[in-house]
Amino acid sequence: VPRWRQQWSGPGTTKRFPETVLARCVKYTEIHPEMRHVDCQSVWDAFKGAFISKHPCNITEEDYQPLMKLGTQTVPCNKILLWSRIKDLAHQFTQVQRDMFTLEDTLLGYLADDLTWCGEFNTSKINYQSCPDWRKDCSNNPVSVFWKTVSRRFAEAACDVVHVMLNGSRSKIFDKNSTFGSVEVHNLQPEKVQTLEAWVIHGGREDSRDLCQDPTIKELESIISKRNIQFSCKNIYRPDKFLQCVKNPEDSSCTSEI
């Protein structure tokens, strides 16, 4: 008789999840000499321990504490790039501008990027059928709590000028309900962070509007200013050219506005 299994609204755990996490850990520690000391089996055990045998709607930040300790990594505080709804371009940028870091350029972010996972209360099984959806089921699910925890800590670490890449093609360029809007903005430390600089990425080829005047950007400016952090904003009209100019800054076409 098949065991009754909780059906959640979201997709199940990514197939080959344990193997993927372990392989990513090994790859990351091989590429980054400063993380060579990390024991990837211990990392996987700590990751697994955060959600296995626990109700997937009752996960806490404390559940991830052992993993957070094992993944400790000093990030240059003045080289942090946050992003919202424009992950691919942010990652393309840090692949070229190697001294800047998104969360997914850290070990913990790299391990979990684009993956889904959850377990079941009182069994050691991973649920590959379904996992809780943040909206339809519960917010304290393994994936959401993980990203909330690491995003908060990543924002806490930032100093000097912090950059954020925002998607100018979205109806809400700045969304208060995004991870950036609900977690990272509120965990920037005014004693350390002088300025938040937003880069608004344009989507349309002929879009010459100043999206820094968008009402949601003004809302972001207001939130940041109230936290005693300065705010600045730049339009990136041509993201393709922007990336090209990061690669080849001495190119003659890179002196004009991008």
């Epitope: 930040e61 404390e62 300790k69 400790t72 990594q73 000093t74 800590r153």
Partner: nanobody, 116 residues
């Protein structure tokens, strides 16, 4: 850069008490998880107790019910109250400050000796 300085170590009889204190520099120390570790002669350093930035505590099984960790974010201190001390608690005790993306820092250590 975080700097940590332990104090309060010394010689105490079995069953006695000591209070270790760790003074820390740095305006954002409240963001760090703070811990006490110990290292006995010829042994590896081991976690004694930790308190997260959110205030959650965790203790080694060997000290549960005897030791209490606390923090004062306003004063930038973390303390370890040690009661019912045993000879096997003899070690150098180290203060630790750790943040996932800001790194880990250690004090120089303070000697605790439990002996009659």
């Amino acid at each position: 850069q975080v700097q940590l300085q332990e104090s309060g170590g010394g010689l105490v009889q079995p069953g006695g008490s000591l209070r270790l204190s760790c003074a820390a520099s740095g305006s954002t120390l409240r963001l760090y998880d703070m811990g006490w570790y110990r290292q006995a002669d010829g042994k590896q350093r081991e976690l004694v107790a930790e308190i997260t930035s959110g205030g959650s505590t965790n203790y080694a099984n060997s000290v549960k019910g005897r030791f209490t960790i606390s923090r004062d974010n306003a004063e930038n201190t973390v303390s370890l109250q040690m009661n019912s001390l045993k000879p096997e608690d003899t070690a150098v005790y180290y203060c630790n400050a750790e943040h996932t993306f800001m790194g880990a820092y250690w004090g120089q250590g303070t000697q605790v000796t439990v002996s009659s």
